[in-house]
């Protein structure tokens, strides 16, 4: 299953399959997740080692047993690949690293006014993989405000150096934020020229295109079909690049198919997995296991659950079957693609779904009336769990926020439904940033069921929590995916990086905002909070957040929305915006429903009809 815990001061011994430089453990983990054979990783921050060559070292590891011996190493961080972790799988990495220079091939230099502008330039340049920006205080005046766009053979820095007044980061193309746009068309009987960066075997052009999209240096591809004249080249997928970023020439060629990487698509990227099953096709590779199962879909599920399995063949040969079960061959290779593809067989083949974003779990958990005042604009995909709860009576208006916690579940505040308990009047918008983008054609979710906490009473602050079951499940994308829930009764974790988001009022007597706002707010102890609200009872099922001096807070229209905190690189839903005395007043923190205290209730209510809790447990 999915394992998300990180091991501090620990290093996995042996099992190395690749190594590279990454700026932090989270990026190292992402590279492990997307590497076909990596199950475990170890990362050496700059502070953990004197050897300059090994600083920022990211070591990707494999193990037949799924684990490796851990040795103590001060400062080292180790962990697991996020294969099988559903919506947590993403190649998008937004962080900016201060005081760090990520080295690579510098192919473009320009003057910009901010690191964000530099990142935007990288994202909008077809060849840029990462960048470095020299701030206004950089020691050499002539380099100040320089934005260096970079690439490297592996897509990661060739070296990382600690350097004052330099900030570095990665292209946001994997976040589907590129302004370049993409070519969706694929061209039959056409072969592209230029430099081959990799060669893999694929069953069709679609798989070839997805592999190209997630390969760090592939910009376009040519696929040779299974009826290509040269037998040894059949099903070959050639991943290609060029200096210009586009093919310099193309040749009409029967039984070839060419196309482009979809990494520059805006708003939608293909999933990093291949879910189609190919009847009459055998995939060859290294044998991992053979098991008897009933049906090709069960064979695919078996492969997906066995984390090292990359692809499979389900044989329908009479000698491979007994009763209703047939042999399911679980296989792997060095590059994650079959080493041989045979047609006209009595098998059906396909790939593991371990990198698919869409698990079938309805709630994500982890083991281990009020807008934002004093906030700033959010950007696309920054808070992909945030939803807008809108009511359509004569006109339509935003009333509350909410958090997507599963394909079919939204968590919000009970008081949002005071006086509006009818599910038909509600429309739930997900995957949006600007309320003004909502038109009559914008898709929305309707409510199947509103589940208000049984102990909630109107005009009381207690148990201000409600679940919404959507009529139809939502697909996950970079802009629409769930927030993980804390573990039950989570009291030991000290959260230092917490944010509240919403479209609510920007001042007490204000109006709903167009762009989703965000504000970084520190948590306040319940004792401190109780002192500020002497007329109310602050229970252990509430959590407070705010600045002593005020100025930043949630406000009307943010109710039901998330208070999220980042811990060990992972966001968790700590609170639900509930109530407060005015907005952003001095010494009047916002009060939030403490989600950890309601985990039993959430899990009980989100249980599937067959009585099984459909929840994802990354640890």
């Amino acid at each position: 299953g999915c394992l998300t815990q990180l091991y501090e001061n620990a290093f996995f011994r042996g099992g190395d399959v690749a190594s590279m430089y990454t700026p932090n453990a989270q990026y190292c983990q992402m590279r492990c997740t997307f590497h076909p054979r990596c199950l475990l990783f170890s990362f050496l921050p700059a502070s953990s080692i004197n050897d300059m060559e090994k600083r920022f070292g990211c070591f990707l590891k494999d193990s037949v047993t799924g684990t490796l011996p851990k040795v103590h190493r001060t400062g080292a961080v180790s962990g697991h690949s996020l294969k099988q972790c559903g919506h947590q799988i993403s190649a998008c990495h937004r962080d900016i690293y201060k005081g760090v220079d990520m080295r690579g091939v510098n192919f473009n230099v320009s003057k910009v006014s901010s690191v964000e502008e530099c990142q935007k330039r990288c994202t909008s340049n077809i060849r840029c993989q990462f960048f470095s920006y020299a701030t206004q205080t950089f020691h050499k005046a002539e380099y100040r405000n320089n934005c260096l766009l970079k690439y490297s053979p592996g897509g990661t820095p060739t070296a990382i150096k600690v350097l004052s007044n330099v900030e570095s980061g990665f292209s946001l193309k994997p976040c589907a934020l590129s302004e370049i746009g993409c070519h969706m068309n694929i061209f039959q009987h056409l072969a592209f020229s230029d430099v081959d960066v990799a060669r893999v075997l694929t069953p069709d052009a679609f798989v070839c295109r997805t592999i190209c999209t997630y390969h760090p240096n592939c910009l376009f591809f040519t696929f040779y079909t299974n009826v290509w004249k040269i037998e040894s080249q059949r099903n070959v997928c050639l991943l290609k690049t060029s200096e210009s970023g586009t093919p310099s020439s193309s040749t009409p060629q029967e039984n070839t198919i060419s196309g482009y990487s979809l990494l520059t698509c805006k708003r939608t990227l293909p999933e990093p997995c291949h879910s189609k099953i190919y009847p009459g096709v055998d995939f060859g590779g290294e044998e991992l296991n053979v098991t008897f199962v009933k049906g090709v879909n069960v064979c695919q599920e078996t492969c997906t659950k066995m984390i090292r399995c990359q692809f499979f063949t389900y044989s329908l040969l009479p000698e491979d079957c007994k009763e209703e079960k047939c042999k399911c061959f679980l296989r792997l290779s060095m590059d994650g693609s079959p080493t041989r593809i045979a047609y006209g067989t009595q098998g059906s083949s396909g790939y593991s779904l371990r990198l698919c974003n869409t698990g079938d779990n309805s709630v994500c958990t982890t083991k281990t009336s009020t807008r934002i005042v004093g906030g700033t604009n959010s950007s696309w995909g920054e808070w992909p769990w945030q939803v807008s709860l809108q009511v359509k009576l004569t006109a339509q208006r935003h009333l509350c926020g909410g958090s997507l916690i599963g394909h079919q579940w939204v968590l919000t505040a009970a008081h949002c439904f005071d006086g509006l308990p009818l599910q038909d009047v509600w429309r739930i918008y997900s995957g949006i940033l600007n309320l003004s983008d909502i038109t009559k054609d914008t898709p929305f979710s309707q409510i199947k069921e509103i589940i208000i906490h049984q102990n909630y009473k109107v005009s009381e602050g207690n148990h201000d929590i409600a679940l919404i079951k959507l009529q139809a499940p939502l697909n996950y994308t970079e802009f629409q995916k769930p927030i993980c829930l804390p573990s039950k009764g989570d009291t030991s974790t000290i959260y230092t990086n917490c944010w509240v988001t919403g479209w609510g009022f920007s001042k007490e007597k204000g109006e709903i905002q167009n762009i989703l706002q965000k504000v970084n707010i520190p948590l306040v102890t319940n004792e401190e909070c109780q002192k500020r609200y002497q007329d109310y009872k602050i229970t252990q099922r509430m959590v407070c957040a705010g600045y002593k001096e005020g100025g930043k807070d949630a406000c009307k229209g943010d109710s039901g929305g998330p208070l999220v905190c980042k811990h060990n690189g992972m966001w968790r839903l700590v609170g639900i915006t509930s109530w407060g005395e005015g907005c952003a007043r001095r010494e009047q923190p916002g009060v939030y429903t403490k989600v950890a205290e309601y985990m039993d209730w959430i899990l009980e209510k989100t249980q599937s009809s067959d009585g099984k809790a459909q929840m994802q447990s990354p640890a």
């Epitope: 068309n185 069709d204 679609f206 299974n226 293909p270 009459g280 329908l316 006209g344």
Partner: antibody, heavy 119, light 107 residues
Framework: EVQLLESGGGLVQPGGSLRLSCAAS????????MYWVRQAPGKGLEWVSG????????MYADSVKGRFTISRDNSKNTLYLQMNSLRAEDTAMYYC????????????WGQGTLVTVSS | DIQMTQSPSSLSASVGDRVTITCRAS??????LNWYQQKPGKAPKLLIY???SLQSGVPSRFSGSGSGTDFTLTISSLQPEDFATYYC?????????FGQGTKVEIK
């Protein structure tokens, strides 16, 4: 030039049998997956059956499973559909089609042969 | 089986009109979506494959878009020869399934 030519259709009583043929030319027949698709009068298209390049893998729509058998003779460049226990609802124009490798689309179609099941 | 739902089932339009036909799959089919045109008494003809790629010989006024579950066929400026029935088809899983068709008639 790719050509597909169906034959064998006609009028048959319920419970009866027919064998459709599809003669292929203009391409290397033995390397392509082939399909039968039908269209009832005034209705939409319905996939009936498919067969792998060597004939080892066969697939059927639930509505014809157990009654129809798809086969091919690569030496004769011919695709067949043996239809037994015919019903009135099997009345349709039957098309043979060739899948285009790598893109999973039915790129070439025959002109169709009409099967009428009636007493 | 994956259900393919086309809308509208029929439409009346004039020469020069922009026509849009939508197709929705009951589950995600990635880009494994094809569009066919069929004229009375004729076999279907492939127009668009892989959701958005124009088949060779098909006029550029035809275009396709979409991925996942929602797809669109657009005829930018309807011509007399375009009056026909249009079908979408998913090739993602067996059995491949077709939409019920959209008949484009002369207004």
């Amino acid at each position: 030039e790719v050509q597909l030519l169906e034959s064998g259709g006609g009028l048959v009583q319920p419970g009866g049998s027919l064998r459709l043929s599809c003669a292929a030319s203009g391409f290397t027949f033995s390397t392509y997956e082939m399909y039968w698709v039908r269209q009832a009068p005034g209705k939409g298209l319905e996939w009936v059956s498919g067969i792998g390049s060597s004939g080892g893998m066969t697939m059927y729509a639930d509505s014809v499973k157990g009654r129809f058998t798809i086969s091919r003779d690569n030496s004769k460049n011919t695709l067949y559909l043996q239809m037994n226990s015919l019903r009135a609802e099997d009345t349709a124009m039957y098309y043979c089609a060739r899948e285009q490798p790598g893109i999973a689309a039915l790129q070439f179609w025959g002109q169709g042969t009409l099967v009428t099941v009636s007493s | 089986d994956i259900q393919m739902t086309q809308s509208p089932s029929s439409l009346s339009a004039s020469v020069g009109d922009r026509v849009t036909i939508t197709c929705r799959a009951s589950q995600s089919i990635s880009s494994y979506l094809n569009w066919y045109q069929q004229k009375p008494g004729k076999a279907p003809k492939l127009l668009i494959y892989a959701a958005s790629s124009l088949q060779s010989g098909v006029p550029s006024r035809f275009s396709g878009s979409g991925s996942g579950t929602d797809f669109t066929l657009t005829i930018s400026s309807l011509q007399p020869e375009d009056f026909a029935t249009y079908y979408c088809q998913q090739s993602y899983s067996t059995p491949p399934t077709f939409g019920q068709g959209t008949k484009v008639e002369i207004k």
